[in-house]
Interface confidence: medium
């Protein structure tokens, strides 16, 4: 299975609201181990 930062981030976030590939979460810090690098 994919274990890049991108894929892990998407699994961690659970429900995605994408804006240019950025995971959004208004309540808790969500690691974006890819877009934010």
């Amino acid at each position: 299975s994919c274990n890049t930062a991108t894929c892990v981030t998407h699994r961690l976030a659970g429900l995605l609201s994408r804006s240019g590939g950025v995971v959004k979460d208004n309540f808790v810090p969500t690691n974006v181990g890819s877009e934010a690098f």
């Epitope: 890049t4 590939g21 950025v22 974006v32 890819s34 877009e35 934010a36």
Partner: antibody, heavy 122, light 107 residues
Framework: EVQLVESGGGLVQPGGSLRLSCAAS????????ISWVRQAPGKGLEWVAE??????????HYAEAVKGRFTISRDNAKNSLYLQMNSLRAEDTAVYYC?????????????WGQGTLVTVSS | EIVLTQSPATLSLSPGERATLSCKAS??????VSWYQQKPGQAPRLLIY???NRYLGIPARFSGSGSGTDFTLTISSLEPEDFAVYYC?????????FGQGTKLEIK
């Protein structure tokens, strides 16, 4: 205010060891992924290693050039990141930066320390 | 390893002119590309993430575009403080990689 302060750089002989530290403040350190990135004098940027958050079991990834020689670790109680560098080579000479990156609310965050210089020379 | 190739290596322009910097990836990286600016003696500064999103506080004259393998950073009208080295990076696959940089110098 987020702050990252690297330390531990210096002059070391080829084959020697050094441990770099990155002291973090201004955020909940344990929640976030963090990397070491280096830059040889007059050269470009090179990613070295990454450690994930406590909730991700602090999983690690390394660049091929340092795999087996460098170890990234974190002490969440001390809000500190480390890079243990063994079997150092001349080509490891660089400024080493710690880099924090995450998404908090609606804005991506990206913070760099000021860097610490490692010189490997006899 | 995904190789990022930046062009040109050096770009000589005058303030007020438009700068166009290119970054080509050896494999598809969707939009997981960032652009950094670095000045001598300073840490890199994130300008663009996700290929086209401006980072916090970055002036509107900086814009990014592209997807797949071809990416562009455009500075619409150069200010004196924009002369620096620019790097693209990809974070789609490990290892994260950077381009070799484009030096933007005053003509």
């Amino acid at each position: 205010e987020v702050q990252l302060v690297e330390s531990g750089g210096g002059l070391v002989q080829p084959g020697g060891s050094l441990r770099l530290s990155c002291a973090a403040s201004g955020f909940t350190f344990s929640n976030y992924w963090i990397s070491w990135v280096r830059q040889a004098p007059g050269k470009g940027l090179e990613w070295v290693a990454e450690i994930r958050s406590e909730s991700d079991a602090s999983a690690t990834h390394y660049a091929e050039a340092v795999k087996g020689r460098f170890t990234i670790s974190r002490d969440n109680a001390k809000n500190s990141l480390y890079l243990q560098m063994n079997s150092l080579r001349a080509e490891d000479t660089a400024v080493y930066y710690c880099l924090l990156y995450f998404d908090y609310g609606l804005a991506i965050q990206n913070y760099w320390g000021q860097g610490t210089l490692v010189t490997v020379s006899s | 390893e995904i190789v990022l190739t930046q062009s040109p290596a050096t770009l000589s322009l005058s303030p007020g002119e438009r700068a166009t910097l290119s970054c080509k990836a050896s494999k598809r990286v969707t939009t997981y590309v960032s652009w950094y600016q670095q000045k001598p003696g300073q840490a890199p500064r994130l300008l663009i993430y996700g290929a086209s999103n401006r980072y916090l506080g970055i002036p509107a004259r900086f814009s990014g575009s592209g997807s797949g393998t071809d990416f562009t950073l455009t500075i619409s009208s150069l200010e004196p403080e924009d002369f620096a080295v620019y790097y693209c990076s990809q974070s789609y696959n490990y290892p994260y990689t950077f381009g070799q940089g484009t030096k933007l110098e005053i003509k």
